[in-house]
Amino acid sequence: QAGPLPKPTLWAEPGSVISWGNSVTIWCQGTLEAREYRLDKEESPAPWDRQNPLEPKNKARFSIPSMTEDYAGRYRCYYRSPVGWSQPSDPLELVMTGAYSKPTLSALPSPLVTSGKSVTLLCQSRSPMDTFLLIKERAAHPLLHLRSEHGAQQHQAEFPMSPVTSVHGGTYRCFSSHGFSHYLLSHPSDPLELIVSGSLEDPRPSPTRSVSTAAGPEDQPLMPTGSVPHSGLRRHWE
């Protein structure tokens, strides 16, 4: 007796982070024996969509002609073969940008920093938000995000880096997100170029794991995870 059908592969083109109004195609690739493909979206009635396979039957295409908030979320796909339904694919998280106005990204004390010193990237939103993401151009994943606990919303998040090395240099942007959905992000901030001078080499630096602050207009430093409720932003390392 054959074992369970292998799970399909799920991906999005041109990528899984899509600006509002742009088109995106979700692909589900199974096996040549597939007769039907099903796409499920978390917290939506299943199936979210069904498609017949494209020749040679090992994959199906699910098209989103214009990205909106309704399409943002977590997807899984399945295929049906003569022996039944496959295991679910690994999840695909489809994120939409442009849900909110762009935050402001700055570097303290300056975007020009000497190797071995410290710098803090500050992402500020004029309205209260509960998640801030910092990304670096050409990095595979967000460097980190700061998410507020217990729904406490903040106007800013600080991303400290220490000690800085040449690898920290590059172009950064930040995004903010509201509590409605973590799959909806703001427009990206304007880019910030971090320029590192000096020669203290460290091949694999990372942002320092120090206490995060996310003061709003009050400028009250906030405590890390595990402290009093409503006390700030939880740091998620990617």
Epitope: Y100, S101, A215, P217, D219
Partner: antibody, heavy 120, light 110 residues
Framework: EVQLVESGGGLVQPGGSLRLSCAAS?????????ICWVRQAPGKGLEWIGS?????????YYATWAKGRFTISRDNSKNTLYLQMNSLRAEDTAVYYC???????????WGQGTLVTVSS | DIQMTQSPSTLSASVGDRVTITCRAS??????LAWYQQKPGKAPKLLIY???TLASGVPSRFSGSGSGTEFTLTISSLQPDDFATYYC????????????FGGGTKVEIK
């Protein structure tokens, strides 16, 4: 030319309603700005009414005194912002301005204003 | 709530005078403060943003300073065109605000 043009003002009786419009040109309301309404009663200072985020979700925030009676909305296809005002009172008599929050967090683009008079 | 308090409410001065207007926030607003000039019958005009940055086309006799809760607008040598009302404004947008503007300062001829 980048500008905001308000319309819809006029005379309205106490308890009545009015909808003001603000047409944007030279930039898109769906680009990364907030837009707000500000009013100024005769001989008085500037008073913020509320703001709407131009992001697709369209979050709105209102001054504490404006909640319930004032509603800000937008129609991206017409590149127009609206202010719906209900249960109007004599003290709502003012010039109403449509204003853009710039990248610098300041109010960098103002309409010419439209006068609303609430009187019987 | 963040409240903006401007002083003085009226200021009498002469052409050539150095004029200073103060704006105090009830809690820190970092440097997110702007100053506006308004003349009768006209919409306000942005003078200074981010506490100290001069808006495009604004004469250099205007300057701004401060951060946190205390801010000042200075006109180094008052000109005839400067007699107007001036307002400060903080840049935050929230649901617990009564207003984002200070009460205004009218600069009149002495």
């Amino acid at each position: 030319e980048v500008q905001l043009v308000e319309s819809g003002g006029g005379l309205v009786q106490p308890g009545g309603s009015l909808r003001l419009s603000c047409a944007a040109s030279g930039f898109s309301l769906s680009s990364s700005y907030w837009i707000c309404w500000v009013r100024q009663a005769p001989g008085k200072g500037l008073e913020w009414i509320g703001s709407i985020d131009s992001g697709s979700v369209g979050i709105t925030y209102y001054a504490t005194w404006a909640k319930g009676r004032f509603t800000i909305s937008r129609d991206n296809s017409k590149n127009t912002l609206y202010l719906q005002m209900n249960s109007l009172r004599a003290e709502d008599t003012a010039v109403y301005y449509c204003v853009r929050h710039g990248d610098n967090w300041a109010l960098d683009l103002w309409g010419q204003g439209t006068l609303v008079t609430v009187s019987s | 709530d963040i409240q903006m308090t401007q002083s003085p409410s009226t200021l009498s001065a002469s052409v050539g005078d150095r004029v200073t207007i103060t704006c105090r926030a009830s809690q820190s607003i970092n440097s997110w403060l702007a100053w506006y000039q308004q003349k009768p019958g006209k919409a306000p005009k942005l003078l200074i943003y981010k506490a100290s940055t001069l808006a495009s086309g604004v004469p250099s006799r205007f300057s701004g300073s401060g951060s946190g809760t205390e801010f000042t607008l200075t006109i180094s040598s008052l000109q005839p065109d400067d007699f107007a009302t001036y307002y400060c404004q903080h840049g935050y947008i929230r649901g617990d605000l009564d207003n984002v503007f200070g009460g205004g300062t009218k600069v009149e001829i002495k």
